[in-house]
């Protein structure tokens, strides 16, 4: 979390980021609160980026103004107009590029003074695993996909019942790089499976973690995944 | 050769569901966000949503928010709208169409549309 | 939400004339406005990205012009495939609003 005071003249007032991460290629939200003013037309919302020449977006009187706004961000930005009167300034950043990444500024003006605080934004690609048994294979085999991550991950296994175990001799995962060249997909096969046990596939890069367990009985097959965003702090 | 090819239209009655399919064919599908723009009977045309080129983020209209999904089946070079508790003013051609690659928000290519019938 | 409005709703000229159409948005939305034609049982067809970028493949006498809140599509001499409705669209926000088409007709 960082927060940011204003500076000399008017009043400061307190403006707050999230530094967080986007998917490429699925639209993102770079978050920023400010202590809200009572007339909308009385605020001024401008986003920048470091090493970036024109605006990311700006937001005045009570509409969006485009007209500095920088070539790279071209129809990919909105602010959520209906509640910046309640002090959310977060933007709305459409289809997230690789070139998105970097350090961006949240800078308001409202009538009762001035504010700033910088947000660190990771961009990457990060999907939820898939654990399936693979009925191809000669023996008892468990297959993970994820279909796009970037930059390249780690796969660990674990088992429940095997704690603590190096599954490394007996797993092989393979990256496969994906049609715009950017994110791979992640297959990852593991060997002598044992019934009734419950599989853990791992992935995580430096901006996410995902899980993906299968157990595996007798009589039934159960799934679940998830995936955590690592590093989001606020300022 | 670009190809975008809807099916699924159909009559149905008010309050009523319908599934909708875009075959895409002749680009690299999984790289584009994709939109579903409908045009009803003598109208001009209707933006109603997209959904981005790996299918996890989705934006709808107004007038559709909370009743309609869209989706997309990579694996399958497929565009899904699912409609529920349609309304007559829900009648119209469906047309899928390709949002640009680099900068978005405007479509270089659309199927020939799927009419779509609400009424009792 | 952008509202775009398109004049005239029908405008009827000769073939070798020259078409003017406008497209005036509700608040100021830079060059982020699209123009698209469509003919009947058709889809329609893009013919200028961000008010005067030209399409590929699409004939020179069409053009944009304009910034902020007014825009213009011209073409220089009408052939007789041109008769059709013009849409403009709003390729700014999240929400792709369009105008409510021009039917460009044979007088």
């Known amino acids: 979390l960082i927060i940011g005071f204003g500076i000399s003249g008017r009043h400061s007032i307190t403006v707050t980021t999230v530094a967080s991460a986007g998917n490429i290629g699925e639209d993102g939200i770079l978050s920023c609160t400010f202590e809200p003013d009572i007339k909308l037309s009385d605020i001024v919302i401008q986003w920048l980026k470091e090493g970036v020449l024109g605006l990311v977006h700006e937001f005045k009187e009570g509409k969006d103004e485009l007209s500095e706004q920088d070539e790279m961000f071209r129809g990919r930005t909105a602010v959520f107009a209906d509640q910046v009167i309640v002090g959310n300034a977060s933007l709305r950043l459409k289809n997230v590029q690789l070139t998105d990444a970097g350090t961006y500024k949240c800078y308001i003006i409202t009538s009762k003074g001035k504010g700033n605080a910088n947000l660190e934004y990771k961009t990457g690609a990060f999907s939820m695993p898939e654990v399936n048994v693979d009925y191809n294979a000669s023996s008892e085999t468990l297959r993970c996909e994820a279909p796009r991550w970037f930059p390249q991950p780690t796969v660990v296994w674990a088992s429940q019942v095997d704690q603590g175990a190096n599954f490394s001799e007996v797993s092989n995962t393979s990256f496969e790089l994906n049609s715009e060249n950017v994110t791979m997909k992640v297959v990852s096969v593991l060997y002598n499976v044992t019934i009734n046990n419950t599989y853990s596939c791992m992935i995580e890069n430096d901006i996410a973690k995902a899980t993906g367990d299968i157990k595996v009985t007798e009589s039934e097959i159960k799934r679940r995944s998830h995936l955590q965003l690592l590093n989001s702090k606020a300022s | 050769e670009v190809q975008l090819v809807e099916s699924g239209g159909g009559l149905v009655q008010p309050g009523g569901s319908l599934r909708l399919s875009c075959a895409a064919s002749?680009?690299?599908?999984?790289?584009?966000?994709m939109s579903w723009v409908r045009q009803a009977p003598g109208k001009g045309l209707e933006w109603v949503a997209y959904v981005s080129s790996g299918g996890g983020s989705t934006y709808y209209s107004d007038s559709v928010k909370g009743r309609f999904t869209i989706s997309r089946d990579n694996a399958k070079n497929t565009l899904y709208l699912q409609m529920s508790s349609l309304r007559a003013e829900d009648t119209a051609v469906y047309y899928c169409?390709?949002?640009?690659?680099?900068?978005?928000?405007?479509?270089?290519?659309w199927g020939q549309g799927t009419t779509v019938t609400v009424s009792s | 939400e952008i509202v775009l409005t398109q004049s005239p709703a029908t405008l009827s000229l000769s073939p070798g004339e020259r078409a003017t159409l406008s497209c005036r948005a509700s608040?100021?939305?830079?060059?982020?406005l699209h123009w698209y034609q469509q003919k009947p049982g058709q889809a329609p067809r893009l013919l200028i990205k961000f008010a005067s970028q030209s399409i590929s493949g699409i004939p020179a006498r069409f053009s944009g012009s304009g910034s902020g809140t007014d825009f213009t599509l011209t073409i220089s001499s009408l052939e007789p495939e041109d008769f059709a409705v013009y849409y403009c669209q709003n390729g700014h926000s999240f929400s792709l609003t369009f105008g409510q088409g021009t039917k460009l007709e044979i007088k």
């Open positions: 169409a390709r949002e640009s690659y680099s900068q978005g928000n405007y479509f270089d290519y």
């Open positions: 608040q100021s939305i830079s060059d982020y």
């Open positions: 002749g680009f690299t599908f999984s790289n584009y966000y």
